[in-house]
Amino acid sequence: MAVTACQGLGFVVSLIGIAGIIAATCMDQWSTQDLYNNPVTAVFNYQGLWRSCVRESSGFTECRGYFTLLGLPAMLQAVRALMIVGIVLGAIGLLVSIFALKCIRIGSMEDSAKANMTLTSGIMFIVSGLCAIAGVSVFANMLVTNFWMSTANMYTGMGGMVQTVQTRYTFGAALFVGWVAGGLTLIGGVMMCIACRGLAPEETNYKAVSYHASGHSVAYKPGGFKASTGFGSNTKNKKIYDGGARTEDEVQSYPSKHDYV
């Protein structure tokens, strides 16, 4: 039960995270005008990865796309790339994880295959989350650098003769959405990797040893517990149903090759 819950929760958390990454990537408010120097501005500027917007006193908002590719800063291109890679990996991860879910049956898919798929999707979610966090952090760093540069220009430029306030930008809502979404995707991926450990059945045959009281001969019985454990060679990687009310997860799981991922 715990494995299914962990896997299901990991899937849901990752799904929310990837939805958040997509939302953040599409949002226009990656950077918003800093109102510290002009809190009463009638013209409010904000920018996204794809376009910049201006909200005017009439309440009308005009957005203009960045129609140039070569004229854009390399950092912005890098952020775009990181976010897109994050979305693509996350989407593939979601697709893979749907088929890996324990509660969904697809033909006679073996547990080892589901475990592998769970691990794959988990890793994809982790990388996707890291891409989003990296993208948002690079953009945030760019904002901080530009903020202090424009602050320096504000106080040194023009010798204070003309009151021209340079527009400074601060963190927009999209950055926080991106950080949270990236974190959720990362957590979801870790949960999928943890769930993978409990999914994979044991591949080793356990040798049973019978101990007798002193003075009697010791008999070694290879494969002695095959019938009772259900992990003999004839039932390898197959689920055992004993007619009881137990759920699949209550069948004891043993250490496997996925233990030390």
Partner: antibody, heavy 115, light 113 residues
Framework: EVQLQQSGPELVRPGASVKMSCKAS????????MHWVKQSHGKSLEWIGY????????SYNQKFKGKATLTVNKSSSTAYMELRSLTSEDSAVYYC????????WGTGTTVTVSS | DIVMTQSPSSLTVTAGEKVTMSCKSS????????????LTWYQQKPGQPPKLLIY???TRESGVPDRFTGSGSGTDFTLTISSVQAEDLAVYFC?????????FGAGTKLELK
């Protein structure tokens, strides 16, 4: 055609209040802020404030805080401005203004404060 | 508050003459976000509400004759009427649309000789 039809002239006593209306037509009322401007006789224009018809959010000129109150009725596409504690200084023509670049002006409401 | 100073306060002209009026703001009205100057020009005739002529300092409103031209950037702006017509006799106001409170100039009154 975008139009702003304002209520008729008002003659009020000093200390009283007045509430004027501005009915919008020809555009989506919630698309633009509604601004109010005062024009005293033979004088320039003074911005009073604006209201966002979507959420009722307002911004006032410090000079008119406590004097003017802006409200809207979305269902009837009408904006209202109430002026209280009127004095002779408040005698003026009041305009509502909207759309992009504040291009459309109302017909104007003349308020005369006299005892 | 941004102070808008218009000059001259009145102008006496003859039909067909070229007219220039000035508007200065105490702070820059330039918005780096979209590279626009948020200065608007209005024309007001007696008994009528103001009419929008020019926005963004130099963009003519649709329906406005091309004899009206706006220019300038930052803090200094100009409205030019290339050839004054009788129907142009009115008061012209400039307005700061960049910062609250929105402020207007005192106006330039155009009169016929």
């Amino acid at each position: 055609e975008v139009q702003l039809q304002q209520s008729g002239p008002e003659l009020v006593r000093p200390g009283a209040s007045v509430k004027m209306s501005c009915k919008a037509s020809g555009y989506t009322f919630t698309d633009y802020n509604m601004h109010w401007v005062k024009q005293s006789h033979g004088k320039s224009l003074e911005w009073i404030g604006y209201i966002n018809p979507n959420n009722g959010g307002t911004s006032y000129n410090q000079k008119f805080k406590g004097k003017a109150t802006l409200t809207v009725n979305k269902s009837s596409s009408t904006a209202y401005m109430e002026l209280r504690s009127l004095t002779s200084e408040d005698s003026a023509v009041y305009y509502c203004v909207t759309t992009r670049y504040l291009a459309v002006w109302g017909t104007g409401t003349t308020v005369t404060v006299s005892s | 508050d941004i102070v808008m100073t218009q000059s001259p306060s009145s102008l006496t002209v003859t039909a067909g003459e070229k007219v220039t009026m000035s508007c200065k703001s105490s702070q820059s009205l330039f918005n780096s976000g979209n590279q626009k100057n948020y200065l608007t020009w209005y024309q007001q005739k007696p008994g009528q509400p103001p009419k929008l002529l020019i926005y963004w300092a130099s963009t003519r409103e649709s329906g406005v004759p091309d004899r009206f031209t706006g220019s300038g950037s930052g803090t200094d702006f100009t409205l030019t009427i290339s050839s004054v017509q009788a129907e142009d006799l009115a008061v012209y106001f400039c307005q700061n649309d960049y910062s609250y409170p929105l402020t207007f100039g005192a106006g330039t009154k155009l009169e016929l000789k």
